[in-house]
Amino acid sequence: EEELQVIQPEKSVSVAAGDSATLNCTVSSLIPVGPIQWFRGAGPGRELIYNLKEGHFPRVTAVSDPTKRNNMDFSIRISNITPADAGTYYCVKFRKGSPDVELKSGAGTELSVRAKPS
């Protein structure tokens, strides 16, 4: 069985304040079953940015339809970027359970925010 990979192809993304940022993430396998979550930061204090299953994330949308059968693209788009959104974002795969168990994290994508062009 091939080991699951969580692929974040861009090490860094730079976006002008006010624009949208796309953070790409794909998985190499549909197995095991379980959700993908996006976090900012890697430590215990990391912030949950997007959870497909539940929660209210008004500025974050999935790029692909996550409910689509055989979907392996878990990229997200964050709208109306502000300087406070800067940081390193991690796409993390969980195994379904009670509670879900963290399996593997992507390498992270650092989001930097440029001043809005005048």
Epitope: F39, R40, G41, G43, P44, G45, R46, E47, L48, I49, G55, H56, G87, P99, D100, E102
Partner: antibody, heavy 117, light 108 residues
Framework: DVQLVESGGGVVRPGESLRLSCAAS????????MNWVRQAPGEGLEWVSL???????YYADSVKGRFTISRDNSKNTLYLQMNSLRAEDTAVYYC???????????WGLGTLVTVSS | EIVLTQSPGTLSLSPGERATLSCRAS??????LAWYQQKPGQAPRLLIY???TRATGIPDRFSGSGSGTDFTLTINRLEPEDFAVYYC??????????FGGGTKVEIK
């Protein structure tokens, strides 16, 4: 406006238990790790415990095995169950929100726990 | 585990003077250092993070500097409301999160 309001403090004897609560409002509680930080009278700040957004828990060595942190995201409430209390646990206990880069950006006003025989 | 040592323990100054507070780490911590202010009977308030970045709403008379093991919080032209206890914190030493022992800035 972010608000953190602690409750449940009081005076107990050594060996007894107490449960602290922290009611959070003004932010999406379930998206953030939460902490308890304490301050003994006239002393500095001591981090006590953290619960992550995925409910992983961390404790200072001084409270490990005696204190249990938990959260109820449906009630926007953080808890600290304190068992086998000792005199050295006497302190003001603050509930604090932590950011992704490990900064304590919002704090409650604290609740005083006094352990005395 | 990293230890943060703050000095002096107490700083006695008059309003309008400059306060220089030190925080020394037992091993290098890059620039991941934060400062908090605590007034009597109040919760701590975040002042500065990543050594030099002021938190939202913090006046520019507060500034941070340093790198490696030696860090400084400077308060230019002390205002009456600045007399308080100041704590440093290593942002990336977790768990546990580590605070310095504090420096009290009192009115002379």
């Amino acid at each position: 406006d972010v608000q953190l309001v602690e409750s449940g403090g009081g005076v107990v004897r050594p060996g007894e238990s107490l449960r602290l609560s922290c009611a959070a409002s003004g932010f999406t509680f379930s998206n953030f790790a939460m902490n308890w930080v304490r301050q003994a009278p006239g002393e500095g700040l001591e981090w006590v415990s953290l619960i992550s957004v995925t409910a992983t828990t961390y404790y200072a060595d001084s409270v490990k095995g005696r204190f249990t942190i938990s959260r109820d995201n449906s009630k926007n409430t953080l808890y600290l169950q304190m068992n086998s209390l000792r005199a050295e646990d006497t302190a003001v206990y603050y509930c604090a929100k932590v950011t992704w880069n490990n900064l304590f950006d919002y704090w409650g006003l604290g609740t005083l726990v006094t352990v005395s025989s | 585990e990293i230890v943060l040592t703050q000095s002096p323990g107490t700083l006695s100054l008059s309003p309008g003077e400059r306060a220089t507070l030190s925080c020394r780490a037992s091993q290098p911590i890059d620039s991941y250092l934060a400062w908090y202010q605590q007034k009597p009977g109040q919760a701590p308030r975040l002042l500065i993070y990543n050594t030099v970045t002021r938190a939202t709403g913090i006046p520019d008379r507060f500034s941070g500097s340093g790198s490696g093991t030696d860090f400084t919080l400077t308060i230019n032209r002390l205002e009456p409301e600045d007399f308080a206890v100041y704590y440093c914190q290593h942002q990336y030493d977790w768990p546990p999160y580590i605070f310095g022992g504090g420096t009290k800035v009192e009115i002379k």
